[in-house]
Amino acid sequence: AGVFELQIHSFGPGPGPGAPRSPCSARLPCRLFFRVCLKPGLSEEAAESPCALGAALSARGPVYTEQPGAPAPDLPLPDGLLQVPFRDAWPGTFSFIIETWREELGDQIGGPAWSLLARVAGRRRLAAGGPWARDIQRAGAWELRFSYRARCEPPAVGTACTRLCRPRSAPSRCGPGLRPCAPLEDECEAPLVCRAGCSPEHGFCEQPGECRCLEGWTGPLCTVPVSTSSCLSPRGPSSATTGCLVPGPGPCDGNPCANGGSCSETPRSFECTCPRGFYGLRCEVSGVTCADGPCFNGGLCVGGADPDSAYICHCPPGFQGSNCEKRVDRCSLQPCRNGGLCLDLGHALRCRCRAGFAGPRCEHDLDDCAGRACANGGTCVEGGGAHRCSCALGFGGRDCRERADPCAARPCAHGGRCYAHFSGLVCACAPGYMGARCEFPVHPDGASALPAAPPGLRPGDPQRYL
């Protein structure tokens, strides 16, 4: 066991042209924070894949407000280290992702808005217990400078934090076959005792009492070979004994056994092995007391001292049913975003995303505008998984290719006549009305209702609307 430590030194514009705009403004002050994600090995995994070695979030940095006209400086950073504890051995080679996040502190509805400013990733070799390693990474126009190290937590030592050290029992020397623990010369290496019976050829341990298998072996003591040849038959042996995947439908698919019964296939059909207190072909019959342990998923049994008196299961959060055998419908909270469909699989929630969205909760809006062009000076607007063009004046249609008729909406009031014009539209007002859209009546004495007609225009003149 040990800790990976990350120290951010600076985050700011990188060298070269094209300095990034400051992420904060006087109108929207903000502050930075960082997230680190670690994965073992030299994996080229996507950012969304699990951080198997661990992850950490920094504190928020000081609030920063841009000074108008000043170039974006190095931004104020959070105090302290980012620490990622690891429970098992340090793998020696690892992949990292460091994300710089901006928290806007304006008065948004629902609290601060977060946005990802930069993400850097890399693959490194690093021995635990070594000195700080320095690094510089660039993401677009931003540059991140940082240092990192891995250190073991006592009593673990070594480059992988797998050797254990204990204080010496005798002042002069360590026991037979045990070396002094460098750099703690006053301590001795402790023997690592694996789980009893763990195969010495095919198993190993990094923590006392465990048994981890080398590739090609499985089972609690690593004594069972993972066979591939026996998997070739249409329904080969079960995965528990061989490590094979069992394809194809079978009578136990969907588990027909109720009340936590386990299903095993027979030559003709299936057989249920029922838990205590249940019987019947599908374990559907109960003559149960609390002594039989009828409550599943950690439910608490109350009453039911004898088979004739009823028992009640008080279910833990997330479960319900007379035996706590049913999961609560977690999808009713609608965790999927952007119209995604929620599926409660029991062990996890899944979201089936609509076109244009991705991510575990459909939170990523795919770039609808990528490769799409809006004609005649229109700009592409993302949203809802389908691109939309915001067209320049005088153009319309899906891609702004059609000339818009500015008179189509009948913009001239009080019977005024509309004329299309290269810069917009012109209204020729009916007698008694004036204004850009003929919206103002002219009083009989020649005075107009507010606002007054611009100088040089008589009430009957066409008004150009720009």
Epitope: C37, R337, N338
Partner: nanobody, 120 residues
Framework: EVQLVESGGGEVQPGGSLRLSCAAS????????MGWYRQAPGKQRELVAG???????KYAESVKGRFTISRDNAKNTVYLQMSSLRAEDTAVYYC??????????????WGQGTLVTVKP
């Protein structure tokens, strides 16, 4: 690991009010959806009110106009203000949250529940 800690339950007379709080703590990157479920004896657990993944609020028909859900993002806390309470609101109220962890994974968590009893 993430913990949800509820408070504010108790006994109240019909027509009375209570305010429940639920604070989330632990390895949280962000809270995607969070709300309150309740379970009355012998009944299925049902959603009472919640903030969905899209940030909108959702209420059970039976509590609309009487219960209000609110949140404090800075404290990772949601509140349920319950007014005009009725006998049929008696239940164990559970806080629930769909959380994005520091590892980027999403997990669904439950609180231990707080008992609300409405009786004359």
């Amino acid at each position: 690991e993430v913990q949800l800690v509820e408070s504010g339950g108790g006994e109240v007379q019909p027509g009375g009010s209570l305010r429940l709080s639920c604070a989330a703590s632990g390895s949280i990157f962000s809270i995607n959806a969070m709300g309150w479920y309740r379970q009355a004896p012998g009944k299925q657990r049902e959603l009472v009110a919640g903030f969905t993944g899209d940030g909108s609020t959702k209420y059970a028909e039976s509590v609309k106009g009487r219960f209000t859900i609110s949140r404090d993002n800075a404290k990772n806390t949601v509140y349920l203000q319950m007014s005009s309470l009725r006998a049929e609101d008696t239940a164990v109220y559970y806080c629930a949250a769909d959380v994005q962890l520091l590892t980027s994974d999403y997990e669904f968590y439950w609180g231990q529940g707080t008992l609300v009893t409405v009786k004359p």
